[in-house]
């Protein structure tokens, strides 16, 4: 909501919900950085060191099985995402510790920010994906044993990209840089032009295409994976199935404060009382919603040490028997032993 | 040479409006800098009272936010205060004046002459 | 609001005499950058406020050098090496660090 209606309460920089209300002061206090400011700058210190190590080596350990492991394609791309992201923190840090200050120009103001977003984009369709492919898996097994191919991975994660993007430009678009005078400071933010209906529906559109509707068809689909699954109890690979499902979980647990504070900051007046307890706590919601950009390599670590039973292999071992485990399809009973063997040899990971 | 001009009524009613023109010349107001409203009250009392930027982003003093507008006309080079539900503690000189600079090094360089208001019924 | 104390409220002086104007301030106005907003402006009778400091310490174009600023966090102060006819007025400091924005009250410079 940054966007400038030329009036600012405590703006919280760079995330896209604000709406800039210039005629409210930006700093009441001078020198002292707010409590939500405060906690996150921690949680983007954490983010980014665990983010970029942890992201980084999951790139690494998948970039080498994504020719032959279609698992591997979309654990790659998801931490790719996640990477990116990552590389916009010190950034965004910096704005922070400079009260919400942005010297670093209005490329980098229109660029930076939108990584969140493109982020979240990028995962959520990724994700999607990732959610057919199990669900073709367990309810299409037939199919995948004939089309289910890294080519077609590969297409599939150009396709969530490409998509991502342009979702991603409206934001793009409409972040500008402006300039303060008591304190002299430039700000980043998004500039609606004084158009509540387009702030709005924005928002509205990140809500929906965000974070409600990927939410009600994944909850769909892993009801119905779940329920096969749990049914025949005749799947090898509930590994990734269960390692997906905590993604895809944690994906919505930490979108959730941004989502609802950027829908109501959009449908409230940037005076009112609530708006601006909202924009106080704006970068915090910011940085909470940034722990998606971590939390991947510690679902990788956690599940890994769960199916070990404890920590006997090296990171990237561990991570390579994650992330890169082979799917055996043995859904239907009619299917005969030269069927699945077949299947073991053609299908590829999920 | 940057020079400023205020104009408007000299009286005006309680509860009335006061709406005051700030004439720039020698620089566009959309080039560059904060363009501001100050009044000094009878006692020699300064106060700022907001300004609209280049951009055309507006600042207001909280004690006035509730009554303050500035506006401006990019085609005339001007500048507008408008300053409702006025009262006689609204009596003073209302000044325009430009602030900016080299970032960081902002102040008031150019000033206004300034134009009298006195509110009385 | 940031509270702005300058003393004193009149100063008479002898010409050629130095002078010494202060500014205090319930906070400190040393922005979270470093910098310190504190500008000192005169004003002559019948006049507009004309800038002499800005960032406590920088004379503005123009301004002759017997006009010094100096001080830190919440102490600031102006000082005139050696007072002639034409200094003579009100002098303002302004604090542009906090918002709003806020000017002293104010210090007349008269003849003795």
């Known amino acids: 909501m940054d966007s400038f209606n030329y009036t600012t309460p405590d703006y919280g920089h760079y995330d896209d919900k604000d709406t800039l209300d210039l005629n409210t002061p930006v700093d009441k206090t001078s020198n002292t950085l707010r409590v939500p400011d405060i906690l996150a700058l921690v949680i983007f210190a954490v983010v980014f060191l665990v983010g970029v190590l942890g992201n980084a080596l999951v790139v690494w350990v998948t970039a080498f099985e994504a020719k032959r492991t279609i698992n591997a394609i979309w654990f790659l791309n998801l931490a790719v995402a996640d990477f990116l992201s990552c590389l916009a923190l010190p950034i965004l840090f910096t704005s922070i510790v400079q009260h919400h200050h942005w010297p670093f120009g209005g490329a980098a103001c229109s660029i930076l920010p939108s990584l969140i977003l493109l982020n979240m984009y990028a995962s959520i369709l990724l994700l999607a994906t990732i959610s057919a492919d199990r669900f073709l898996l367990v309810f299409k097994p037939i199919w995948c044993q004939n089309f289910r191919g890294a080519g077609l991975a590969w297409i599939a994660c150009a396709v969530a990209w490409g998509l991502a993007l342009l979702l991603t430009i409206p934001s793009f678009l409409y972040r500008v840089v402006r300039e303060e005078y008591f304190p002299p400071k430039v700000l980043c933010g998004v500039d609606y032009s004084h158009d509540k209906r387009r702030e709005r529906a924005v928002a509205i559109v990140r809500l929906v295409l965000g974070f409600l509707w990927p939410l009600l068809t994944l909850t769909i689909c892993y009801t119905f994976i779940l329920l096969r699954t749990w049914s025949r109890r005749a799947t090898r690979s509930t590994k990734t199935l269960k390692v997906v499902v905590a993604v895809v979980a944690s994906f919505f647990i930490f979108w959730l404060p941004y989502q609802v504070t950027g829908i109501m900051m959009s449908f409230l007046e940037p005076s009112s009382p609530t708006f601006l307890l909202l924009k106080k706590l704006d970068s915090l919601c910011v940085s909470f919603a940034y722990i998606n950009c971590c939390i991947n390599p510690i679902i990788y670590v956690v599940a890994g040490q769960g199916f070990q039973g404890r920590l006997r292999k090296s990171l990237p071992s561990l991570l390579r028997n994650v992330l890169t485990e082979e799917s055996v399809v043995r859904e239907s009973k009619s299917f005969t032993r030269s069927t699945v063997d077949t299947m073991a040899q053609k299908t590829q990971a999920v | 040479d940057v020079q400023l001009q205020e104009s408007g009524p000299g009286l005006v009613k309680p509860s009335q409006s006061l709406s005051l023109t700030c004439t720039v010349t020698g620089y566009s107001i959309t080039s560059d800098y904060a363009w501001n409203w100050i009044r000094q009250f009878p006692g020699n009392k300064l106060e700022w009272m907001g300004y609209i930027s280049y951009s055309g982003s507006t600042s207001y003093n909280p004690s006035l936010k509730s009554r303050i507008s500035i506006t401006r006309d990019t085609s005339k080079n001007q500048f507008f205060l408008q300053l409702s539900s006025v009262t006689t503690e609204d009596t003073a000189t209302y000044y325009c004046?430009?602030?900016?600079?080299?970032?960081?090094?902002?102040?008031?360089?150019?000033w206004g002459q300034g134009t009298s208001v006195t509110v009385s019924s | 609001d940031v509270v702005m104390t300058q003393t004193p409220l009149s100063l008479p002086v002898s010409l050629g005499d130095q002078a010494s104007i202060s500014c205090r301030f319930s906070q400190s106005i040393v922005y979270s950058n470093g910098n310190t907003y504190l500008q000192w402006y005169l004003q002559k009778p019948g006049q507009s406020p004309k800038l002499l400091i800005y960032?406590?310490?920088n004379r503005f174009s123009g301004v002759p050098d017997r006009f010094s600023g100096s001080g830190s966090g919440t102490d600031f102060t102006l000082k005139i090496s050696r007072v002639e006819a034409e200094d003579l007025g009100v002098y303002y400091c302004f604090q542009g660090s906090h918002v709003p924005p806020t000017f002293g009250g104010g210090t007349k410079l008269e003849i003795k």
């Open positions: 004046a430009r602030y900016g600079g080299n970032y960081p090094t902002y102040a008031m360089d150019y």
């Open positions: 960032k406590v310490s």
